[in-house]
């Protein structure tokens, strides 16, 4: 038996992090995102739950809704109508999938100081929103869309086809919510509130995933979800637009699908209103390397939406899939014709392009061996975007302004030199025409949110600087975090290493690799975090490393598309390469190396453990994918094609975890899954376990009854991290 090794941070009055600190969220940070309601005004919910209205220019603040009114209906969220007369109060939040939830809504009349009593809203509502002007309400109830001209008016039913698990109007089905739209809604108001566009998803022919939910009853409940796995029948999607001024005169009008898309299976990917009578729809072929952006106009004479062929813009990838994780959305100019969009340039880096007539004639706005990530706002004279250009670190995000009024356009980094050490990873929130904006810095230092003048970029005010967190961390021994790159052959891999306090290069430390590794993901980011791995480094003296291998994002398509049609190969290979390089650094105890990951990371960690290299002593897979045939069509097929003989069935089969069951014999494997995982079904772990049993390979397992993909209920999460900690400490011979 190996003697137990106890890591003791040396003589220091500061204490190490404890697992309890992590589980209690003791060191969580705050961000501040203004809820913009005009060019210079925003709302924010105060610590004591008052809804406070701020005017930047007068520096005045008003409590427009008191916490007592919020409390009277147990409201946890709110939404102000654009005419400022009403506010909806949301309560009885009940989570469904990643973004979706149902809730009860109450309408409060701010001008009368009372709740609207007539024609109260049904419950529970699946989605509710105000029109962009006035106080019309659109909501989805039992998969149908309803409209109210005013909160106290009777509702008008717009759709009648809605049916549970069959037809969804104005809300996405499971696969569209998770893999395409990343929203709980599928309806969009036109800017003037005249039209309402919505999507109808028909899931009638989709196979059902069924799993038990044990609850407390004598019999478990069965959860049924239409869930298309790779190669299965997909939702049939149609887009409609209804005139909300006279919804009863003319019914919803269907928007035509571009011919080149409609000729085979396809997806709707997003909708963007350009002006009050112009809309832009994006479509994608089922084989996701061709995307079409279609601009459609309302024809008053026909009472129809026309999408001329010369307003169709095709985006195609020859090396992989279209877009990044999702196909980017356009940011239209004031002329309502031209737009800015991020897509790959000739060198395979994603950059901003300006499209005036055709994609072929697009003018490239940014360029370089880095990537433009998101366009925040286009105004008359400026375009604001984020990128990872600064100092060549892919895991940073800075905000840039391009003065499009100038010729040639001039570029300025708004954030690069603001708080250079503390802040290297930003996002932003802009008022309507970017007169003001908030910057939210996520690290690597303590997060800070600030308010800025959109003309001069001058900082006006600190909104949140996490002073309390700063004070509570003063007596904590935090690990040291390094972000560096390593080279292997012609490849460069960025890694983040979390080193124990008083790290000494001349000593040997156990190593834990944390991996995600999914296509278009990024783990090596310059962000602040105090989490489980921070604790493992701080208290248990474990070196943690995260490595972005091939397939990860924001380093060009050559690196990204390397994994196309062959998932499970290079992601694993690159983790192994990195481990070998870390061993060469001299401070890693090669007898004590582990790997762990969740979801896609569980897949990669499983394959790495089963790589037969002998590099890993042990590892953990939480909610892993075990075969791409078990996962959602939109995701699996984007990166793997179809599981058919004439397409890519062979690699679907040989990239499973089950195919490598024999190779787990010489590692300690902990397999964990929630039984109510709607996303990566428990089936995945059940099949791994079956294969390991069939191969007579010993392993450890833990299931979490009625837990979903996040295993996030307080008790389960505590149990999970405590269990994984024991497993790791045992593996590394660290005493409790």
């Amino acid at each position: 038996l190996r003697p137990s090794r106890v890591y003791k941070p040396e003589g220091n009055t500061k204490r190490a992090l404890t697992l309890k600190d992590i589980l209690n969220g003791t060191f969580s940070y705050k961000t501040y995102f203004p809820n913009w309601i005009s060019e210079q005004e925003y709302l924010h919910q105060s610590e004591d739950d008052n809804i406070v209205f701020y005017n930047i220019e007068t520096r005045e603040s008003y409590i427009i809704l008191s916490n007592s009114t919020m409390k009277s209906v147990n409201a946890t969220d709110y939404g102000l109508s654009p005419d400022r007369q009403f506010v909806y109060l949301e309560s009885d939040y009940s989570k469904l999938w990643r973004y979706s939830y149902t809730a009860t809504y109450y309408i409060y009349d701010l001008q009368n100081g009372e709740f609207v009593r007539g024609y109260e809203l049904p419950r529970p509502i699946q989605y509710l929103c105000w029109s962009p002007v006035g106080s019309k309400l659109a909501y989805v109830y039992q998969n149908n869309i309803y409209l109210k001209q005013r909160p106290g008016d009777p509702p008008f039913q717009i759709t009648y086809t809605g049916r549970e698990n069959r037809i969804f109007n104005g809300i996405p089905d499971w696969v569209y919510e998770e893999e395409m739209l990343a929203t709980k809604y599928a309806l969009w108001w036109s800017p003037d509130g005249k039209f309402l566009a919505y999507v109808e998803f028909n899931d009638s022919d989709i196979p059902i995933i069924a799993y038990s939910y044990y609850g407390d009853g004598q019999y478990p409940r069965t959860i049924n979800i239409p869930y298309p796995k790779a190669g299965a029948k997909n939702p049939v999607v149609r887009v409609f637009i209804v005139d909300t001024t006279y919804p009863h005169h003319v019914g919803p009008m269907e928007v035509p699908v571009p011919e080149m898309i409609a000729s085979s299976d396809y997806y709707f990917s997003w909708l963007t209103w350009v002006s009050s009578e112009r809309v832009c729809l994006q479509w994608l072929k089922r084989v996701q390397n061709v995307s079409v952006l279609s601009i459609c106009d309302f024809r008053e004479d026909w009472h129809a939406w026309e999408c001329p062929k010369n307003q169709e813009h095709v985006e195609e990838s020859r090396t992989g899939w279209a877009g990044g994780f999702f196909v980017s959305t356009p940011a239209f100019s004031q002329d309502a014709t031209s737009y800015y969009k991020i897509f790959s340039d000739k060198d395979g880096y994603k950059h901003i392009h300006y499209i005036k007539d055709t994609v072929e004639n697009a003018i490239q706005i940014t360029s370089g061996k880095w990537e433009a990530i998101y366009i925040f706002r286009v105004t008359q004279d400026s375009l604001f975007y984020s990128s990872n250009e600064f100092e060549g670190y892919p895991g940073r995000r800075n905000i840039y302004r391009i003065s499009i009024g100038n010729s040639p356009p001039s570029k300025k980094c708004v954030t690069c030199h603001l708080r250079k050490e503390r802040c290297q990873y930003y996002t932003a929130s802009f008022s309507y025409k970017a007169k003001y904006y908030a910057l939210v810095c996520y690290g690597p230092g303590l997060p800070i949110s600030t308010l800025h003048d959109g003309r001069t970029d001058q900082e006006i005010q600190v909104l949140e600087e996490n002073k309390e967190l700063e004070n509570s961390l003063r007596n904590i021994q935090l690990p040291k975090v390094e972000i560096k790159k390593l080279k292997d052959g012609g490849l460069t891999f960025w890694y983040k290493m979390i080193l124990p306090p008083q790290f000494d290069r001349s000593k040997k430390y156990p190593l834990l690799i944390q991996v995600y590794g999914g296509p278009c993901s990024q783990s090596v980011k310059s962000v602040f975090a105090v989490n489980w791995i921070t604790y493992l480094a701080s208290k248990e003296g474990i070196v943690i490393a995260l490595v972005d291998g091939r397939g990860t994002a924001f380093q060009g398509d050559k690196f990204l598309h390397a994994v196309y049609r062959k998932l499970g190969v290079y992601e694993v290979e690159d983790q192994l390469t990195a481990v070998r390089k870390f061993i060469e650094m001299g401070f890693i105890d090669e007898e004590r190396i582990a790997i762990w990951g969740w979801s896609y990371g569980g897949y990669v960690s499983s394959l790495a453990l089963a790589s037969g290299t002998g590099l890993f002593k042990c590892g953990i897979a939480v909610a892993p994918v075990s075969s791409w045939e078990y996962y959602a069509s939109i995701y699996s097929e984007r990166f793997m094609g179809l599981p058919t003989k004439d397409d890519n069935l062979e690699h679907y089969k040989n990239s499973t975890v089950m195919a490598r069951a024999e190779y787990f014999r010489n590692v300690d494997y902990l397999l964990i899954h929630g039984t109510a995982d709607d996303n990566v079904h428990f089936q995945n772990s059940a099949q791994i376990a079956k294969a390991l049993v069939n191969a007579q390979v010993d392993f450890q397992a833990m299931w979490y009854s009625d837990q979903n993909h996040g295993i996030s209920s307080g008790r389960s999460q505590n149990h999970l991290y405590t269990h994984m900690t024991h497993f790791l400490k045992q593996c590394f011979s660290l005493s409790d």
């Epitope: 005004e41 005017n55 007068t58 603040s61 001008q111």
Partner: antibody, heavy 119, light 107 residues
Framework: QVQLQESGPGLVKPSETLSLTCTVS????????INWIRQPPGKGLEWIGL???????NYNPSLKSRVTISKDTSKNQFSLKLSSVTAADTAVYYC?????????????WGQGTLVTVSS | DIQMTQSPSSLSASVGDRVTITCKAS??????VAWYQQKPGKAPKLLIY???YRYTGVPSRFSGSGSGTDFTFTISSLQPEDIATYYC?????????FGGGTKVEIK
């Protein structure tokens, strides 16, 4: 319900200071600003100034040197002082609520009090 | 100061008529224009704010439109109780300024 009530002397001598009080009820002072507006007999409306929720003030430049608006939150009272008055200051004076929910328009008015400047 | 020029200064119309009053700002005030109704001996009442939003309890025959410098106030069907003076006001910047008023009478 929302109420704003102006009070003060109906007659002020030229060169003296006009002092009015506005007592409000039925709404929270954290939600609204208070404006003072005046209307000379048979004429249009003139904005005098306002006091923000935070206590800051804004005055009409044409009256700025003579006007002071203040508040006593504990009593739900606002006051207007206009110094060195002349006959041209004869008007009905209104205390008016305004705020962000109506884009700083004026949504509730007191019934007004007539102040005559005369010796 | 922003000048608000209101026209006409008075008008006479029959019951049921459509009545339109215009207001022109001396500079861009976005949509920050309000309309008030004042009956003789009474305080003004807010009808429309932010150019087009009807204040709570205001009948739907009153409407407003416009943005920038040109604004319109409409009574779609004049009623006897609408006899009053109507004022526009910009609430865009200080000092808040009013139009000169339009006196509406019944023919």
């Amino acid at each position: 319900q929302v109420q704003l009530q102006e009070s003060g002397p109906g007659l002020v001598k030229p060169s003296e200071t006009l002092s009015l009080t506005c007592t409000v009820s039925g709404f929270s002072l954290t939600n609204y600003d208070i404006n003072w507006i005046r209307q000379p007999p048979g004429k249009g409306l003139e904005w005098i100034g306002l006091i923000w929720t935070g206590g800051g003030t804004n005055y009409n430049p044409s009256l700025k040197s003579r006007v002071t608006i203040s508040k006593d939150t504990s009593k739900n009272q606002f006051s207007l002082k206009l110094s060195s008055v002349t006959a041209a200051d004869t008007a009905v004076y209104y205390c008016v609520r305004g705020g962000p929910l109506v884009w700083y328009a004026l949504d509730y008015w007191g019934q007004g009090t007539l102040v005559t400047v005369s010796s | 100061d922003i000048q608000m020029t209101q026209s006409p200064s008075s008008l006479s119309a029959s019951v049921g008529d459509r009545v339109t009053i215009t207001c022109k700002a001396s500079q861009d005030v976005s949509t920050a224009v309000a309309w008030y109704q004042q009956k003789p001996g009474k305080a003004p009442k807010l009808l429309i704010y932010s150019a087009s939003y009807r204040y709570t309890g205001v009948p739907s025959r009153f409407s407003g439109s416009g943005s920038g410098t040109d604004f319109t106030f409409t009574i779609s069907s004049l009623q006897p109780e609408d006899i009053a003076t109507y004022y526009c006001q910009q609430h865009y910047s200080n000092p808040r300024t009013f139009g000169g008023g339009t006196k509406v009478e019944i023919k």
